[in-house]
């Protein structure tokens, strides 16, 4: 899996007037890393994981960069014509990656009110946009603004590609991201669903990287997809991830079911605990 740095900037307008605030979130290898909020822009490490590694740094450089990016995006939003009444958002997502073979990728995507309308490959400078007329109008609007000073734009986007990669390399060198494997803790619980049935939930937590296989098996055979419910794989704030899978089974058949977990080449199975029902709640309505 490549190392990645992802910037997510959002600015808002109300009745055509661009708001002064903005929100920037930065993810490093999929982990929430920095956040620059509306009222007081301070690039802050997200969670102990990021804070521990870079110690007593003030993050002033990151704060400056994120503030500058927010101002740029506000100016872009101000140039979007025909903004209707009410609340609107312009979002810019910028991603750069360094792959195992040292090749790089960089891209940038613009969303208006949550809808993608313009993308750019920051290496080839190639623009793409969806076919809808609204997206095309927005895209032309934004591209024209960005191209007003062609030279500046060229420099700006080269810099964005180079800066993103430079920052990513700097973080990797600092040891913020280590190619590490942290195995999950797996916990199986049961709760009453309806008469004669129980819901069994298998939770995996504290694992890294995020790729994991978690599923229920009956007599050693995986259950079909539609009989299981999965939770998203979410960061837990400690530089690791958590997720869950649940299924409904007949009471008395618990011993036939196991939770199967596979992570970073290791796998294990976990039985349903016997005994009385622990939690009186249902995952499924």
């Amino acid at each position: 899996e490549p190392h990645s740095l992802r910037y997510n900037l959002t600015v808002l307008s109300w009745d055509g007037s661009v708001q002064s605030g903005f929100l920037t979130e930065v993810h490093l290898d999929g982990q929430p890393f920095l956040r620059c909020d509306r009222q007081k822009c301070r690039a802050k490490p997200q969670g102990q994981w990021a804070e521990d590694v870079l110690g007593n740094k003030t993050w002033d450089r990151e704060t400056r960069d994120l503030t500058g990016n927010g101002k740029d995006l506000r100016m872009t939003l101000a140039h979007i014509k025909d903004q209707k009444e009410g609340l609107h958002s312009l979002q810019e997502i910028r991603v750069c990656e360094i792959h195992e073979d040292n090749s790089t990728r960089s891209s940038q995507h613009f969303y208006y009110d949550g809808e993608l309308f313009l993308s750019q490959n920051l290496e080839t400078k190639e623009w793409t946009m969806p076919q809808s007329s609204r997206a095309q109008t927005l895209a032309m609007n934004v591209r024209n603004f960005l191209k007003e000073d062609a030279m500046k734009t060229k420099t700006h986007y080269h810099a964005m590609h180079a800066d993103c990669l430079q920052e990513l390399r700097r973080y990797l060198k600092s040891g913020v991201v280590l190619r590490r494997t942290v195995p999950p803790m797996v916990n199986v619980t049961r709760s009453e669903a309806s008469e004669g049935n129980i819901t069994v939930t298998c939770r995996a937590s504290g694992f890294y990287p995020w790729n994991i296989t978690l599923s229920w098996r009956q007599d050693g055979v995986s259950l079909s997809h539609d009989t299981q419910q999965w939770g998203d794989v979410l960061p837990d704030g400690n530089g690791t991830y958590q997720t869950w899978v649940a299924t409904r089974i007949c009471q008395g058949e618990e011993q036939r079911f196991t939770c199967y977990m596979e992570h970073s080449g290791n796998h294990s199975t976990h039985p349903v605990p016997s005994g009385k029902v622990l939690v009186l709640q249902s995952h499924w309505q």
């Epitope: 009222q39 007593n56 740094k57 003030t58 002033d60 450089r61 704060t63 400056r64 503030t67």
Partner: antibody, heavy 118, light 107 residues
Framework: QVQLQQPGAELVRPGASVKLSCKAS????????MNWMKQRPGQGLEWIGM????????RLNQKFKDKATLTVDKSSSTAYMQLNSPTSEDSAVYYC???????????WGQGTSVTVSS | DILLTQSPAILSVSPGARVSFSCRAS??????IHWYQQRTNGSPRLLIK???ESISGIPSRFSGSGSGTDFTLSINSVESEDIADYYC?????????FGAGTKLELK
């Protein structure tokens, strides 16, 4: 125009806490961090800490964590620094300063000269 | 804490001369250095931010350079109103720290 008003001087008894004020005007008080510095006679500047008036988030220099308490009163656009258990070592000029961008101080008060003496 | 060493402690110059102040950091601080001027009995005034970025309202004779550990503030033609103490401040690491200052005086 931006102004930070501080009283000129304070005479304090050793051990008796003192609360220094810094009244801001000419800008949106809740949008900028306020920093506090110490300068002893004939010496350089020391950074004590910072507070953000919007939510009173503070960051203190560990050296001053038991010595200084930072607070704000949004209604009067005033920042305060309380000096706890002052000794002669705390005799100095104390400045408040507004932060313009990350950690750069663009407007300074005139400073309050604190003398700790019995 | 990051130690900022300013040299020399005192600089004597003639009006119209070019002068440079040095600030050396005890470790790499990128370009996170800011320069202040403090006249006698006055408050510090921001001159340069982030090593070389100018501040509105500050005369163009003031300039800054450097990155990493070595930084310089220059005045390309000293005027009598420039007589003051000059401090550098770093903002790359907690706590924020200032140098001990350089006093500029006229010959």
């Amino acid at each position: 125009q931006v102004q930070l008003q501080q009283p000129g001087a304070e005479l304090v008894r050793p051990g008796a806490s003192v609360k220094l004020s810094c009244k801001a005007s000419g800008y949106s008080f809740t949008s900028y961090w306020m920093n506090w510095m110490k300068q002893r006679p004939g010496q350089g500047l020391e950074w004590i800490g910072m507070i953000h008036p919007s939510d009173s988030e503070t960051r203190l220099n560990q050296k001053f964590k038991d010595k200084a308490t930072l607070t704000v009163d949004k209604s009067s656009s005033t920042a305060y620094m309380q000096l706890n258990s002052p000794t002669s070592e705390d005799s100095a000029v104390y400045y408040c300063a507004r932060e313009m961008g990350p950690y750069t101080l663009d407007y300074w008060g005139q400073g309050t000269s604190v003398t700790v003496s019995s | 804490d990051i130690l900022l060493t300013q040299s020399p402690a005192i600089l004597s110059v003639s009006p119209g001369a070019r002068v440079s102040f040095s600030c050396r950091a005890s470790q790499n601080i990128d370009t996170s250095i800011h320069w202040y001027q403090q006249r006698t009995n006055g408050s510090p005034r921001l001159l340069i931010k982030y090593a070389s970025e100018s501040i509105s309202g500050i005369p163009s004779r003031f300039s800054g350079s450097g990155s990493g550990t070595d930084f310089t503030l220059s005045i390309n033609s000293v005027e009598s109103e420039d007589i003051a103490d000059y401090y550098c401040q770093q903002s790359n690491y907690w706590p924020l720290t200032f140098g001990a200052g350089t006093k500029l005086e006229l010959k």
